[in-house]
């Protein structure tokens, strides 16, 4: 196999740029989703975000996040999600397990799912960027 050592493929400046891009795109998605009035956040959905037992950026649950965003893309045609997925794929290993999402069937519940996950994704990218930058600071001290 030609698969190369991971260290060749993860300059920290690239990872930070990817997460910064994801953070910016998550804000765009949330702004778009929030334009739908009368929809409330639900306690029934939780987006996996950071894993406590891994180092940044491997601590980001990128495959699960991708699956949730792919579900939103199928429920509501948000083109920004295409770009989000392309950037998440930069953090996902080819052999990462698939995540199955149970999709709400009720129209209003679908809207609540989209808003809730979009909000959690935005918060998650803020946390991911913080964990990256604090990790980088620790590495230099």
């Amino acid at each position: 196999s030609h698969t190369l050592p991971v260290r060749l493929l993860r300059p920290s400046d690239d990872v930070q740029k990817i997460v910064e891009e994801l953070q910016s795109l998550s804000k765009m998605l949330l702004k778009d989703v929030e334009e739908e009035k009368g929809v409330l956040v639900s306690q029934n959905y939780t987006l996996p975000c950071l894993s406590p037992d891994a180092q940044p950026p491997n601590n980001i649950h990128s495959p699960a996040i991708r699956a949730y965003l792919k579900t939103i893309r199928q429920l509501d045609n948000k083109s920004v999600i295409d770009e989000i997925i392309e950037h998440l794929d930069k953090l996902i290993f080819q052999d990462a397990p698939e995540t199955n999402i149970s999709v709400p069937t009720d129209t209003h519940e679908c809207k609540r799912f989209i808003l809730t996950i979009s909000q959690q994704f935005s918060e998650c990218m803020d946390l991911a960027l913080k964990s990256l930058t604090s990790g980088a600071q620790q590495a230099t001290t």
Partner: antibody, heavy 122, light 107 residues
């Protein structure tokens, strides 16, 4: 050994469609993007679109949107590129290509099909 | 869409010369850039990926480097078998556009 084998040369009339296939062997992973590229005689490489075969997720160049459809059949490890409303300027060699791991996103296309010559002529 | 501006479009150099080809991205694409070599009538071949990593089996005279949004392919000592057209391609976000190509000839 990873191999990409494309379908044979085609001669088509203007206004018709062509469907080129690309069969992958020796590759077991599902999280990757495969791309389609074309090259007109004496011209450079032109990106047409890509597919994530595991999900059938596609991306297209704005230039070909509405005329190109990329699909994949997971059961046979085959990708397809269909181009409709053909015109003489679509005469080109069409290539499929895909990357080596370890990430789902590409950073270079390691494997290329042998190319399929499509000639559009009345 | 991200534009890739490749220069020069063609060059002629002597065997043993150092040759440099440049691609400039219209925005920051990190290290998500590849270089290909295409000989006349042949399939493109990956030379460099991730801006500076050599693909398997590529001679050591080929190297890639990056400075900001400028990417350089260097052939340290041009050989007759290096006569080809060279292309860059970015992979930051779709469309994954190519540079216009650089045709390399021997003087």
């Amino acid at each position: 050994q990873v191999q990409l084998v494309q379908s044979g040369a085609e001669v088509k009339k203007p206004g018709s469609s062509v469907k080129v296939s690309c069969k992958a062997s020796g590759y077991t992973r599902t999280r990757y993007w495969m791309q389609w590229v074309r090259q007109a005689p004496g011209q450079g490489l032109e990106w047409m679109g890509a597919i994530y075969p595991g999900e059938g997720d596609t991306r297209y160049s704005q230039k070909f949107k509405g005329r190109v459809t990329i699909t994949a059949d997971k059961s046979t490890s085959t990708a397809y590129m269909e181009l409709s409303s053909l015109r003489s300027e679509d005469t080109a060699v069409y290539y499929c290509a895909f990357p080596e791991g370890p990430y789902a996103a590409p950073y270079g296309m390691h494997y290329w099909g042998q190319g399929t010559t499509v000639t559009v002529s009345s | 869409a991200i534009q890739m501006t490749q220069s020069p479009s063609s060059l002629s150099a002597s065997v043993g010369d150092r040759v440099t080809i440049t691609c400039r991205a219209s925005r920051n694409i990190g290290n998500y850039l590849a270089w290909y070599q295409q000989k006349p009538g042949k399939v493109p071949k990956l030379l460099i990926y991730y801006a500076k990593t050599s693909a398997s089996g590529v001679p050591s005279r080929f190297s890639g480097s990056r400075s900001g949004t400028d990417y350089t392919l260097t052939i340290s000592s041009l050989q007759p078998e290096d006569v080809a057209t060279y292309y860059c391609q970015h992979f930051w976000s779709t469309p994954w556009t190519f540079g216009g190509g650089t045709k390399v000839e021997i003087k």
